[in-house]
């Protein structure tokens, strides 16, 4: 039961951090104007990985896309493909791992392919996880770089727009979202390869005989267990017969054209 | 089209409070706009006052700021300045205007003439 | 407070003739973040409350003649009426809308010549 929960957990989890960098990835304020010094203004600057927003205390608010592709600074087309890579690994991670769910009964899937799917969602989620966060991460650098430059013209880093000295730029609610959107799925990941490790079926010395009433020849298999996958020892024995796999924590029973000894 | 009217006594004591009132039609003051209040004395400049804008938030100009007030009425769409303790000097041609790209006053009311006499 | 000067304070044109008004603030009204300058140009006739003409400096309000343009950016900003009509006898006022509390200049009065 603890392993269906924390892989349920799991799964949960990181559904909510990738939605999250999801909704990072989408979002117009990476960075918004700093506005320490002035903190009622009549214009204010924002801006995303996509498209940069001015926002005129009267309410209009115009936003403009980056139409430039090469013209655009390699840092922010880093981030934007951090961004993409996390979610695409993400997206990926949460389809295989709705496979692998426990409690999600698909023909008859070995607990060993299902331990196998657990890890490698969980492993994805990990890396989805981790490139959201070096995303954010690197975008804050820049926006830390650009904050101490006082040049007239700087050069923003984000767009190419030029910039002059009195509008400066901090960290935008889409760097926080995507730390913990990034934290989620990190953390989902690593419940899922936990999860991975109580699915696993362990080695034992046990044998196994399965008959069979008819008369046709019947099929003698010793080490009946399947091998482990080698993540430590494991609580529940999880007998794989050759008339279909049925697991000891299972509450309803399916009846078998074998006979079990 | 927003039309906005002006409306208040045209005369008002030293020392009392002006209180002044903006009816719009055509539109709704919860929109995305900001709605303003500018004087202009006889003869002279444009001062802007200060506005209410669509999310209730109130902006004046630090020059009258101890001395006004602006709010709205939603159910009856109008906004409201008050400007306490006047002079002669606050005698001038009160307009409410709206306020949206470009934070340009697109539309005005005719205004309304306060004059600040004993 | 941003100070806006207009210049010069009254202007006689002949009709049909060009008249440029001049704005100059003491900061910059350009917004980095999308490159438009917060200046608006207003015409106003007696008795009548001002209209609006141009804003961000050169974009001209919907139903404002053409020969109404406006150019400039930074700190200095220029009306231009190409080919001046009776109608167009007025006060012609320029406002940032850059920075609190916005601020108009003085007014230009244009007359016929």
């Known amino acids: 039961m603890a392993v269906t929960a924390c892989q349920g957990l799991g799964f949960v989890v990181s559904l909510i951090g990738i939605a999250g960098i999801i909704a990072a990835t989408c979002m117009d304020q990476w960075s918004t104007q700093d506005l320490y010094n002035n903190p009622v203004t009549a214009v204010f600057n924002y801006q995303g990985l996509w498209r940069s927003c001015v926002r005129e205390s009267s309410g209009f608010t115009e936003c403009r896309g980056y139409f430039t592709l090469l013209g655009l600074p390699a840092m922010l087309q880093a981030v934007r493909a951090l961004m993409i890579v996390g979610i695409v690994l993400g997206a990926i991670g949460l389809l295989v791992s709705i496979f692998a769910l426990k409690c999600i009964r698909i023909g008859s899937m070995e607990d060993s392919a299902k331990a196998n799917m657990t890890l490698t969602s969980g492993i994805m989620f990990i890396v989805s996880g981790l490139c959201a966060i070096a995303g954010v991460s690197v975008f804050a650098n820049m926006l830390v770089t650009n904050f101490w430059m006082s040049t007239a013209n700087m050069y923003t880093g984000m767009g190419g727009m030029v910039q002059t000295v009195q509008t400066r730029y901090t960290f935008g609610a889409a760097l926080f979202v995507g730390w913990v959107a990034g934290g989620l799925t990190l953390i989902g990941g690593v419940m899922m390869c936990i999860a991975c490790r109580g699915l696993a079926p362990e080695e034992t010395n046990y044998k196994a005989v399965s008959y069979h009433a008819s008369g046709h020849s019947v099929a003698y298999k010793p080490g009946g267990f399947k091998a482990s996958t080698g993540f430590g020892s494991n609580t529940k024995n999880k007998k794989i017969y050759d008339g279909g796999a049925r697991t000891e924590d299972e509450v309803q029973s399916y009846p078998s054209k074998h006979d079990y000894v | 089209q927003v039309q906005l009217q002006e409306s208040g006594p045209g005369l008002v004591k030293p020392s009392e409070t002006l209180s002044l009132t903006c009816t719009v039609s055509?539109?709704?003051?919860?929109?995305?706009?900001?709605w303003n209040w500018i004087r202009q004395p006889p003869g002279k400049g444009l001062e802007w006052i200060g506005y209410?804008?669509?999310?209730?938030?109130?902006n004046y100009n630090p020059s009258l700021k101890s001395r006004v007030t602006i709010s709205r009425d939603t159910s009856k769409n109008q906004f409201s300045l008050k400007l306490s303790s006047v002079t002669a000097a606050d005698t001038a041609v009160y307009y409410c205007a709206t306020s949206y790209y470009g934070n340009s006053f697109i539309y005005w009311g005719q205004g309304t003439l306060v004059t600040v006499s004993s | 407070d941003i100070v806006m000067t207009q210049s010069p304070d009254s202007l006689a044109v002949s009709l049909g003739e060009r008249a440029t008004i001049n704005c100059k603030s003491s900061?910059?009204?350009?917004?980095?973040?999308?490159?438009?300058?917060?200046l608006a140009w207003y015409q106003q006739k007696p008795g009548q409350p001002p209209k609006l003409l141009i804003y961000?400096?050169?974009t001209r309000e919907s139903g404002v003649p053409d020969r109404f343009s406006g150019s400039g950016s930074g700190t200095d900003f220029t009306l231009t009426i190409s080919s001046l009509q009776a109608e167009d006898v007025a006060v012609y006022y320029c406002q940032q809308a850059y920075s609190f509390p916005w601020t108009f200049g003085q007014g230009t009065k244009v007359e016929i010549k």
């Open positions: 900061q910059s009204l350009l917004n980095s973040g999308n490159q438009k300058n917060y």
């Open positions: 055509g539109g709704s003051i919860s929109s995305n706009y900001a």
């Open positions: 961000w400096a050169s």
């Open positions: 209410i804008n669509y999310s209730g938030n109130t």
